[in-house]
């Protein structure tokens, strides 16, 4: 019997600079019960704190809800495991709420074939960013990305859309069944899962262009811009 | 209704003991952090004691230092400071109040008045 | 112990006019400053932290702002219900210590 090995917190994540919650990895527990407790203080400050909340983020997490969570602080936190031979205490770790954000996914994913008569046939792919992000605030900016592939397809062709929330694509196979998911990220941050899949069937008929992909950037009042399948390999793939 | 209600002040001789209790509502007491704060007759604010959400750390001013012992009961939802040793100088309105998670006193109780006098 | 204090300890002022609270640490205290309106007889009320952040309910009239060692309460335009005594107060160490109080009366 040996007092608990040495824990260490690996991760902590904040769905939108509001809230946020810190995981650690137990060390051995040297075959006896071991407590876990996790203490913080912030930059600046000697006041030492509890975890406010061991049960939201499921087992040897630390959740902290709105009214403990603040954007200009640094938090510097350590866990402490005891058991009836001693006690060890992981290295501390400096959390900077900013640097944290990993958001949901975006939201409503919309596919739709486009067959303009006056020009060519495009996938148009439409989506909102998640929930609790407030983009009003000017706090956050998300970039997105956009993952798509024929159904049975092993690779994935990856779009960077910047900070709009649709995108165009010209070039794909006619009569094949996409899959379509999109992601985000804040500016400093961690991407988001990718969002559930949406299906889109890809009309036989739809002629493609294997030169170029066009691709339109709300952001610029609805100009459209060629470009050449090697820039977009180059700027865009990830 | 977020709410602290002190009880337990009463007029006391000098090296006597009294224990006040605060009692909490509408709030998830043992999520919070709590401290004594008081106020002697025309003076200002003075805080006493914390103690954290758990129990498992405390604060005191150096002045009640050896003599006062903050404690709370989470089943409960209650607050107490254990006041031994009183002298004229703790005479004072003795206010409960809750630390919210940045640090600042946010709700705080209507008071309990303790005299020491002989 | 870091030590607060307040200036004035007391003043006088018309309706409308504005009125500036100081308050200085005696060492760098960050921006974990909070200040506290106590009305005659009433419990103190929070009405800003971290310097500059005013609690919802609290008039736009108050304001604060200052960093490390000097802070400032600011009413832009006194009103009668404004009469109250003011208190500084550090959160990042214990002792959490209180300024002494600016007694804000009308003219």
């Known amino acids: 019997q040996l007092p608990p090995g040495k824990p260490e917190i690996f991760k902590c994540r904040s769905p939108n600079k509001e809230t946020f919650t810190c995981w650690w990895r137990p060390g051995t527990d040297g075959g006896l019960p071991t407590n876990y407790s996790l203490t913080y203080h912030r930059e600046g400050e000697t006041l030492m704190h509890e975890c406010p909340d061991y049960i939201t983020g499921g087992p040897n997490s630390c959740h902290f809800g709105k009214q403990y969570t603040s954007m200009w602080r640094t938090y510097i936190m350590m866990v402490n495991a005891t058991n009836q031979m001693g006690s060890s205490f992981s290295d501390e770790l400096y959390v900077d709420v900013t640097y944290i954000v990993q958001p949901d996914p975006p939201l409503e994913l919309a596919v739709e074939v486009k067959q303009p008569e006056d020009r060519k046939p495009y996938l148009w792919i439409k989506w909102s960013p998640p929930t609790l992000i407030d983009l009003k605030t000017g706090w956050f900016t998300l970039l997105y990305e956009i993952r798509l592939k024929p159904e049975k397809a092993a690779e994935w062709e990856i779009h960077f859309a910047g900070q709009q929330t649709e995108f165009k694509i010209l070039s794909l196979h006619p009569g094949q069944k996409y899959l379509v998911q999109v992601r985000c990220k804040p500016d400093h941050g961690y991407w988001s899962a990718w969002s559930p899949a949406t299906f889109i069937q890809i009309p036989s008929d739809f002629t493609m262009n294997d030169e170029q992909k066009l691709i339109s950037e709300e952001d610029l009042g609805g100009e459209q811009k060629l470009i050449s399948e090697e820039d977009l390999h180059h700027h865009h793939h990830h | 209704e977020v709410q602290l209600v002190e009880s337990g002040g009463d007029l006391v001789q000098p090296g006597e003991s009294l224990r006040l209790s605060c009692t909490a509502s509408?709030?998830?007491?043992?999520?919070?952090?709590m401290n004594w704060v008081r106020q002697a007759p025309g003076k200002g604010l003075e805080w006493v004691s914390y103690i954290s959400s758990s129990g498992g750390t405390k604060y005191y001013v150096d002045s009640v230092k050896g003599r006062f012992t903050i404690s709370r009961d989470n089943a409960k939802k209650s607050l107490y400071l254990q006041m031994n040793s009183l002298r004229a100088d703790d005479t004072a309105l003795y206010y409960c109040a809750r630390l919210n998670g940045v640090d600042v006193f946010d709700i705080w109780g209507q008071g309990t008045m303790v005299t020491v006098s002989s | 112990d870091i030590q607060m204090t307040q200036s004035p300890s007391s003043l006088s002022a018309s309706v409308g006019d504005r009125v500036t609270i100081t308050c200085r640490a005696s060492q760098d205290i960050f921006n974990y400053l909070a200040w506290f309106q106590q009305k005659p007889g009433k419990v103190p009320e929070l009405l800003i932290s971290?310097?500059?952040t005013l609690q919802s309910g609290v008039p736009s009239r108050f304001s604060g702002s200052g960093s490390g060692t000097y802070f400032t309460l600011t009413i832009s335009s006194l009103q009668p219900e404004d009469i109250a005594t003011y208190y500084c107060q550090r959160y990042n160490s214990a002792p959490l210590t209180f300024g002494g109080g600016t007694k804000v009366e009308i003219k």
């Open positions: 971290a310097a500059s």
């Open positions: 509408g709030f998830t007491f043992n999520s919070y952090e």
